[in-house]
């Protein structure tokens, strides 16, 4: 058992038939000693008396929000929250697994430039009762601190026949380096709480492999005379590092059709204008990467031919 | 040329040959990315190796003030890695496939390394490390982690020059 | 599978003009650009232009200009290419080729040998 | 317009062995640098396209890198079928040029 935070304890289960559980011993926070009696959750039923209470924990019922009281009032609390081990592997049905960019990632990040700010978000199809809450370094033996916001709700959707809820969070490194080659990871912990059960959930990273620029801004067409060309010019975004001499970025343009399966003109480039065939009722469309390490492109933006 | 004391690099040459470097260093280990290797014991094995750090005066004030800071600190980087890619990690079995650009990458980081130091000039560089794992797999595992840091740490001077390049040059 | 097949051998006098045909099967012809490349006896490829079928627009390289027009009949899936004003250096062999992507050659016809002499 | 220059004109190699191909642009671009295979008296084939993608079919002995002004393309171990002229294409800009090419003979 262990405190996750004031009054608030997480005891940790081997998840199988006929487990022995864990005895877990709760102590009332007061400096009487006679006449205190335990409580669960609502219920009125004295579960035992004196200043501490020994109980067995073993399965969700023995979980909940212990009280001690003394002549009908309230002297403290302590909630249990349980953590299920199966075979070994600590549970993780709180949140989705996104599968992407590999199996088991519930947690995935991404970060506009090099500024130490990124954003992380995990799916959920829970709708009530649940509680998240993050922390974050850079390295874990000696770690450096990293200030993260509150987790919210930031989408909904409908998958098939039931509701997906996206929650995010923003975190700031405090020192950051945008110039220097990272060598420790950030790391991020996500504590999920969901009525009485506890989950955490962490993932490891180099600010540099979860870049992802924000589309191009401000493109726009020139046609050239005599010819079926046009010059589309565009800029870096605003959220992209400066000075763009030292954080360059390099961009892939396109011309398509509504379909992908149509014939396309492509042309990459490290410039922020090219010159490509504009069709009509096709899209010129502009995304960017780093032109140094190879992170994720950014959205498209795009414009029509016409 | 950066010759230690003062003039200032060919930084159009200097440029070319570390965007060619980070080229080279994502073809050689494309996939590299898909591999969690931090869960692989990442501490022993690679932080050994040199990286570019907040102090070493590679942003771009930094740069302005005095690049030679920096360039030092590339250089020890270049020939870090380019004993690293001629040692028995990389010669040793499993073989390397032979379309493997690492061959090219061994080229290129020695031919920037001179471009920054003429024969003649000596800036004090890294001991290597003793890093010869026993088994293949070992071996192999270290490959994928040192191309990786190697993809990380050209990045950077590909950074450095191609802003020497626009900013600094005469 | 996608495939272009060309017309036969041309023999032309200097001055006349060449019209070689490319018919295609196994896609939707308006589907794919298509381009014209030549190839001169013992020599390198050389880009002449391409033609979108699906409306007519072409580009030429500028050294072809006013002397080639590559036209397209969509009722047959045929692209022809017309070369006037013929020269000796013409003489080469003439590929049609496909691609959804405008700027590189993915599918390649066999070939027509176009030979200028007098 | 944009000259590609290729070297060697001709590469001698013995079956088995590997081959580099050079192809430098005589101004950046980028990565829209593409290869062809031709053997006598056939159409070329498309190997390669945007400097390293490897186009479907085609033996993964094969393979492109570069980016900028210099590429190479690297056959790791030459079969017999593989001796033929190579071709390098830019599509950087109108018009689009090719390479001189190289011919990969037995030696």
């Known amino acids: 058992i262990w405190e996750l935070k004031k009054d608030v304890y997480v005891v940790e289960l081997d998840w199988y038939p006929d487990a022995p559980g864990e005895m877990v011993v709760l102590t009332c926070d007061t400096p009487e000693e006679d006449g205190i009696t335990w409580t669960l959750d609502q219920s009125s039923e004295v579960l035992g008396s004196g200043k501490t209470l020994t109980i067995q924990v073993k399965e969700f019922g023995d979980a909940g929000q212990y009280t001690c009281h003394k002549g009908g009032e309230v002297l403290s609390h302590s909630l249990l929250l349980l953590h299920k081990k199966e075979d070994g592997i600590w549970s993780t049905d709180i949140l989705k697994d996104q599968k992407e960019p590999k199996n088991k990632t519930f947690l995935r990040c991404e970060a506009k430039n090099y500024s130490g700010r990124f954003t992380c978000w995990w799916l959920t199809t829970i709708s009530t009762d649940l509680t998240f809450s993050v922390k974050s370094s850079r390295g874990s033996s000696d770690p450096q601190g990293v200030t993260c916001g509150a987790a919210t709700l930031s989408a909904e959707r409908v998958r098939g026949d039931n509701k997906e809820y996206e929650y995010s969070v923003e975190c700031q490194e405090d020192s950051a380096c945008p110039a220097a080659e990272e060598s420790l990871p950030i790391e991020v912990m996500v504590d999920a709480v969901h009525k009485l059960k506890y989950e955490n959930y962490t993932s490891s990273f180099f600010i540099r492999d979860i870049i992802k620029p924000d589309p191009p801004k401000n493109l726009q067409l020139k046609p050239l005379k005599n010819s079926r060309q046009v010059e589309v010019s565009w800029e870096y975004p605003d959220t992209w590092s400066t000075p763009h001499s030292y954080f360059s970025l390099t961009f892939c343009v396109q011309v398509q059709g509504k379909s992908k399966r149509e014939k396309k003109d492509r042309v990459f480039t490290d410039k922020t204008s090219a010159t490509v065939i504009c069709r009509k009722n096709a899209s010129i469309s502009v995304r960017a990467q780093d032109r140094y390490y190879s992170s994720s492109w950014s959205e498209w933006a795009s414009v029509p031919c016409s | 040329r950066a010759v230690p004391g003062g003039s200032s690099p060919a930084w159009t040459q200097c440029q070319q040959l570390s965007q060619k470097l980070c080229t080279l260093a994502w073809s050689a280990h494309p996939l590299v990315g898909h591999m969690d290797l931090r869960e692989e014991g990442d501490e022993e094995t690679t932080n050994d190796v040199p990286h570019i750090q907040c102090g070493d005066g590679c942003d771009p004030q930094g740069l302005r003030d005095n690049s030679q800071f920096c360039l030092q600190r590339i250089h020890q980087g270049l020939i870090f890695y380019e004993k690293l890619l001629g040692s028995d990690i990389f010669t040793g079995e499993p073989s390397l496939l032979p379309d493997s650009p690492v061959g090219q990458l061994h080229a290129s980081l020695l031919g920037l390394s001179q471009l920054l130091q003429p024969e003649g000039h000596h800036w004090e560089t890294q001991q290597i490390p003793s890093l010869s794992p026993s088994q293949p797999w070992q071996r192999l595992l270290l490959r994928f982690k040192i191309l990786r840091s190697l993809q990380a740490f050209v990045a950077v001077a590909a950074r450095v020059f191609a802003h020497g390049a626009a900013t600094l040059s005469p | 599978q996608v495939q272009l097949v060309q017309s036969g051998a041309e023999v032309k006098k200097p001055g006349a003009s060449v019209k070689v045909s490319c018919k295609a099967s196994g896609y939707t012809f308006t589907d794919y650009y298509l381009h014209w490349v030549r190839q001169a006896p013992g020599r390198g490829l050389e880009w002449m232009g391409w033609?979108?079928?699906?409306?007519?627009?072409?580009e030429s390289a500028p050294k072809f200009q006013g002397r080639v027009t590559m036209t397209t009949d969509t009722s047959t899936s045929t692209a022809y290419m017309e070369l006037r004003s013929l020269r000796s250096d013409d003489t080469a062999v003439y590929y049609c080729?496909?691609?959804?992507?405008?700027?590189?050659?993915?599918?390649w016809g066999q070939g027509t040998m176009v030979t200028v002499s007098s | 317009e944009i000259v590609m220059t290729q070297s060697p004109a001709t590469l001698s190699v013995s079956p088995g062995e590997r081959a580099t191909l050079s192809c430098r642009a005589s101004q950046s671009i980028s990565i829209n640098l593409h290869w062809y295979q031709q053997k006598p008296g056939q159409a070329p084939r498309l190997l390669i396209y945007f400097a390293s993608q490897s186009t479907s079919g085609i033996p993964a002995r094969f393979s492109g890198s570069g980016s900028g002004t210099e590429f190479t393309l690297t056959i790791s171990s030459l079969q017999s079928e593989d001796f033929a002229v190579y071709y390098c294409q830019q599509s950087n800009s109108f018009p689009l040029t090719f390479g001189g090419g190289t011919k990969v003979e037995i030696k």
């Open positions: 080729n496909a691609n959804k992507e405008l700027r590189y050659f993915d599918v």
């Open positions: 033609i979108d079928p699906e409306n007519g627009d072409t």
